[in-house]
Amino acid sequence: LTCLGGFASPGPVPPSTALRELIEELVNITQNQKAPLCNGSMVWSINLTAGMYCAALESLINVSGCSAIEKTQRMLSGFCPHKVSAGQFSSLHVRDTKIEVAQFVKDLLLHLKKLFREGQFN
């Protein structure tokens, strides 16, 4: 994970608190899930590597009418508030596999927890 702070520069990275807040929101979503999350909507899976936050946003934004993940979408926007320039991290739009939103959230949560435990905030 080379640039948590978006794509403007590889400079400052999000403080651990911001990462923790995002983790807590994802935990809330998974714990409060009763019916299929977002009616079982499918989203593109992403590479959990550089540019992960913006990639996650670009994938989840395609889910409409699902209030359960709107806060997550807005929090992900905190990491990359301005659009990625064409050509930057082209992997953002590599689209080969679709998974359910619920699985996407679980995968993202597991990865973020791992990063948090390892202190990998940059």
């Epitope: 403007a8 990275v13 999000p14 934004i61 926007s77």
Partner: antibody, heavy 118, light 111 residues
Framework: EVKLVESGGGLVKPGGSLKLSCAAS????????MSWVRQTPEKRLEWVAS???????YYPDSVKGRFTISRDNARNILYLQMSSLRSEDTAMYYC????????????WGQGTTVTVSS | DIVLTQSPASLAVSLGQRATISCKAS??????????MHWYQQKPGQSPKLLIY???NLESGIPARFSGSGSRTDFTLTINPVEADDVATYYC?????????FGGGTKLEIK
């Protein structure tokens, strides 16, 4: 309730400097990007600067190199350091919570007035 | 820079009638099928307030009388029916390309 309170505006001579502050409350400040947007005397709105939750900054060419946006996540304060001020920088400056390019400027403060005049 | 042209500059509408405001962009503001166009309301003496994001999504707490439509370069904000409290200036804003830009505003008055 989300609250954004700007301060630091005033009258400054061309070429001078000024530092604006914005105290945020009612949301997890550290988790959101923030921006400054100004409104000219002619009521035109102009985006001035943005900062991500991680501290990456974004500026239009009109202020790049003259203005610096920063944040103090411990105190929930957003700043705008303005230097080499010009008459065209005269405006009402608003602090806004930026929910990203997909959601726009979700919350705005009441603004602080900056007048650049000799 | 993307130029946003709003029309009309001002309009007067009777209470209970429909108000339609147009915003035209000098180039497309769509990103992978999502229109990065937002609408704000600014009442006299107040700061702007987000009404609509991504062309047609109603921000939380905004009455359903407000609606947005459009894609690529042509966008519309509709208020139906208009109420006295809607007297304000309305602005469109694009976030598809830096620098982010706003339209010149449309002032809504009651006839």
């Amino acid at each position: 309730e989300v609250k954004l309170v700007e301060s630091g505006g005033g009258l400054v001579k061309p070429g001078g400097s000024l530092k604006l502050s914005c105290a945020a409350s009612g949301f997890t400040f550290i988790s959101y990007a923030m921006s400054w947007v100004r409104q000219t005397p002619e009521k035109r709105l102009e985006w001035v600067a943005s900062i991500s939750s991680g501290g990456n900054t974004y500026y239009p060419d009109s202020v790049k190199g003259r203005f610096t946006i920063s944040r103090d996540n411990a105190r929930n304060i957003l700043y705008l350091q303005m230097s080499s001020l010009r008459s065209e920088d005269t405006a009402m400056y608003y602090c806004a919570r930026l929910d990203g390019y997909y959601f726009g400027f979700a919350y705005w403060g009441q603004g602080t007035t900056v007048t650049v005049s000799s | 820079d993307i130029v946003l042209t709003q029309s009309p500059a001002s309009l007067a509408v009777s209470l209970g009638q429909r108000a339609t405001i147009s915003c035209k962009a000098s180039e497309s503001v769509d990103n992978y099928g999502k229109s990065l166009m937002h609408w704000y309301q600014q009442k006299p003496g107040q700061s702007p307030k987000l009404l609509i994001y991504r062309a047609s999504n109603l921000e939380s707490g905004i009455p359903a009388r407000f609606s947005g439509s459009g894609s690529r370069t042509d966008f519309t904000l509709t208020i139906n029916p208009v109420e006295a409290d809607d007297v304000a200036t309305y602005y469109c804003q694009q976030s598809n390309e830096d620098p982010w830009t706003f339209g010149g505003g449309t002032k809504l008055e009651i006839k």
